[in-house]
Interface confidence: low
Amino acid sequence: TPEPKCPEDWGASSRTSLCFKLYAKGKHEKKTWFESRDFCRALGGDLASINNKEEQQTIWRLITASGSYHKLFWLGLTYGSPSEGFTWSDGSPVSYENWAYGEPNNYQNVEYCGELKGDPTMSWNDINCEHLNNWICQIQKGQTPKPEPTPAPQDNPPVTEDGWVIYKDYQYYFSKEKETMDNARAFCKRNFGDLVSIQSESEKKFLWKYVNRNDAQSAYFIGLLISLDKKFAWMDGSKVDYVSWATGEPNFANEDENCVTMYSNSGFWNDINCGYPNAFICQRHNSSINATTVMPTMPSVPSGCKEGWNFYSNKCFKIFGFMEEERKNWQEARKACIGFGGNLVSIQNEKEQAFLTYHMKDSTFSAWTGLNDVNSEHTFLWTDGRGVHYTNWGKGYPGGRRSSLSYEDADCVVIIGGASNEAGKWMDDTCDSKRGYICQTRSDPSLTNPPATIQTDGFVKYGKSSYSLMRQKFQWHEAETYCKLHNSLIASILDPYSNAFAWLQMETSNERVWIALNSNLTDNQYTWTDKWRVRYTNWAADEPKLKSACVYLDLDGYWKTAHCNESFYFLCKRSDEIPATEPPQLPGRCPESDHTAWIPFHGHCYYIESSYTRNWGQASLECLRMGSSLVSIESAAESSFLSYRVEPLKSKTNFWIGLFRNVEGTWLWINNSPVSFVNWNTGDPSGERNDCVALHASSGFWSNIHCSSYKGYICKRPKIIDAKPTHELLTTKADTRKMDPSKPSSNVA
C-alpha cells in the first residue's frame, strides 16, 4: 500500500505521521486559542502538537517558505491542572519541550495557553488564551481535510452614529488620538460620558479584546484616579471593588502617577502621570444620550486666596525662598506644597509664566516648579499631572546631566531668578539642590482678592518705579510728550521682570503699546530715550526688522519695530533711579603677534580675516581659538569703523559677523550682547534657512545667508588692561593670560 501523504500545501516530514499548515492572518482575522482550536478541529485535525525535533523543523520550513518570520502562532499547548501541567489539545502528553528562557512563567496568573515564536529558536511561551494570534493546524497523513469553516460574521458589537460601541447597558468610545487625562476626560464629558470605570473581569475582557482587535494604541486611560495618599477612586463615583493591576503596579513612581492606563497587550493596569498623553476609553450609559441637550458650562464663581498668596486665573500661587531658610530640594518642596493643599506649580501658558516672573522680582534664587523628567529621561511632565502644553526653556536647556554621577541627573526644573536676563526662563537642575519653590493651589470661592493698589494719578508701583498704561492712541513722539507732561517718561523695560509686569498691564486692552526704545533719534542705534543702557532685549522673531524705527510691546509680550508715526497705546514710567552713564572708553592694548594683526577701536580689538574663508561655525571656532568671538556690532560708530576697514577688501570676500538666528527665530549675538543696533541691507533679513549674517564689504550693510557659505570673518575681543603699578593684574573675561607689561605697546587707541 502506498504511504499515506499530506494534502497539498500541508507540510510533512517522512519520520512523522502528522501534516501541518500555518494560518498567518491579518490583524482582524487572528483568533484566540479556543477559536483556533475549534477551527483546526472543524478541518478534522487539531492545533499543532510538536513531539520531536523533526516536527519542529517541518514547521520551521513552512515559516521560511511563507516568510512568516517573528510571527506568533498558537500551538495545542494548554494548561490542565497543577498536577498535569501543560498538555497537547489532541490529548498527547508533552514529551518534547522547547520553552523560551524563563518560560512558562504564568505571568500575572493568566497564562494557560502556549504560543510558538516564528524565529530560528522556535521557542514556546505561555500566554493568555484570549490573545489574538496566528495558528498552526495538524492533521493525520492520508486524511483529507474538511472544508475550512467560513468565518462566523465578526461578532462586532453595534456602533452608534457618533462612533460609540454598544455593550450591554453602556456605550464606549475608543480614541485613536492621544491626549492628557484632563483633555481626554473633557472629551468624554462633552459627549455625555466620563472615562471608563471597569467593574468586572468580563467588562475588562470586553474592552481589552476590543482594543486588541481594532488597531490598538499601546495603552488607554481609564477612569481610575489615585489620590496623593494612594487611595483609589473611580471618576464616576462608583466603588472600587475590582482592580486588575499589572505586575509591580501601581508603583507610584516619583509619587506623581495619579492616573491609570490599561495596557492593550494584556488588559492589565498601570499607574501613570496624568499629563502623559495616551489614548483613552470613554463610557456613557445607554440612557444618557440626548443630542438636544448641551452640557452646561460652569459659571465662573469669584474666588480668592489666603493671606500671602497671589491670585491669578482662578489659582493661588506663593513663592518661597526669599529667605534662605525657606529653600528646599525638589522632593521636600513638593511635600511642602502638598501640605498646603496644592502642589508645585504647573505653568500652563505665557500669561501664567509672566505673572510668576513679575512676582519673582528682587529674588536672588531660582525656584522649583513641578516639571521633571525623573521617571523617563527627556520626557518632562508636571508632577500634578497637568499636560505639558507650554514650555519656556532658557538658552541651552534642558541640558540633562550635571556630572558623570548617575545621582546627579538634572531631572527637576526651576524658573531662573536673580539679576539674569534669562529670569523667568526654565532650567533643568539636580533635584537635590536647595532652591526656592513655587506652590499652587485652587482658589477658594469663600475668599475675595484685594484690588491692586493704584496711586491716585493712575500710576502703579512696581519695584523702584511707577507705571501707567495710557489707553489712548498716539504717535511715538506725541506719546513721549504726553508722558513728560505727566511728570514721567515713556517707559524703558530694563529686565524680564519689568517686561512681564508691562505685558500683564496690557491684559485687558488688546492694543499694542509704545515703549522708550527708539533708533531714529540715535543714528539707527536702538537706545532707551531715558538714557538707560540697553542690556536686556525681548525682540520677537526676526526683529528688529527696521533700521530707523520705534519699538512697541506687542500683545504676545515681545518687542517689534514700527514707523514712529503709527498710533498705539503707550506706557509711561516714573523712577527716581538715575541711569548709569556709559563708562569712559577703556584704556588698554591689543594682543601682538606675528600672525594676527589686531586693530584697536574704543574698548575692543578687532581681527579681520579675508584670506582664509570659512563657514559661520568654523569662523566662530577660529575666533574662539584666538580668545575672542565673532564680532558684535553694537553702535553706528562701530559699524562705520568696520565698514571703513573692510571696504578695501570688497573684491575678496564679504565677512561673517556674530549675529545668528536661533531655533525660535530670535536674532542673537554670539557673545550674548543685546541686539540694540541693526544695519540690514534693503530686503533683509529674508529666507527661512538663512540663519547667519554677513557684512557686505562694499556697503557695510548686513544680509542673512546660509551658515554653510564660505566667507571671511571678523573677530572681536576686549582690550587687555595692563597691570597697575601695584602689580595687581586686571584681565578681561575673554583673555586671562598674563601679558608681559614690559613690552612696548604700539597699538593703543
Epitope: A253, Q331, D373, V374, N375, S404, L405, S406
Partner: nanobody, 124 residues
Framework: QVQLQESGGGLVQAGGSLRLSCAAS????????MGWFRQAPGKEREFVAA????????DYADSVKGRFTISRDSAKNMVYLQMNSLKPEDTALYHC????????????WGYGYWGQGTQVTVSS
Amino acid sequence: QVQLQESGGGLVQAGGSLRLSCAASGRIFSAYAMGWFRQAPGKEREFVAAISRSGDSTDYADSVKGRFTISRDSAKNMVYLQMNSLKPEDTALYHCAARTVSAPPSAAWGYGYWGQGTQVTVSS
C-alpha cells in the same frame, strides 16, 4: 535584560561580619547605578545602600551607616556589600538591584532589575 545573582548570605552571630556579592550578566553593567535592599518577614522592603555608575558616590540608610560598605568592580560586573557589626535587626532577605530611572537612590521604584535575594540571619 540584566540578570542579577546574589550570594554570600548565611547565619552569623551578632557583632560578626558578612560580605554579600551580586553578579550581573546581560546588558552593560556600567550603565547602571546599583543598590542593595532588604526585606524582613512581614515588613516592607527597605533601602540599604546604593552606589553610582562610576562608583565614586554612595548612599546608605541611616540604620547601616558606618557599619556597611557598598562597592563595585565594573571589570568583573560585581557589586559587594560588606556588613560589619551585624545586629539581629539586620536579619532579612537581601536583594541586589539595578537602577533604571533617575529616581532618588533610596527609591525602590527606580530599580528595574532585581535579584532573587540571599538570606542573612543574625542570631543574638
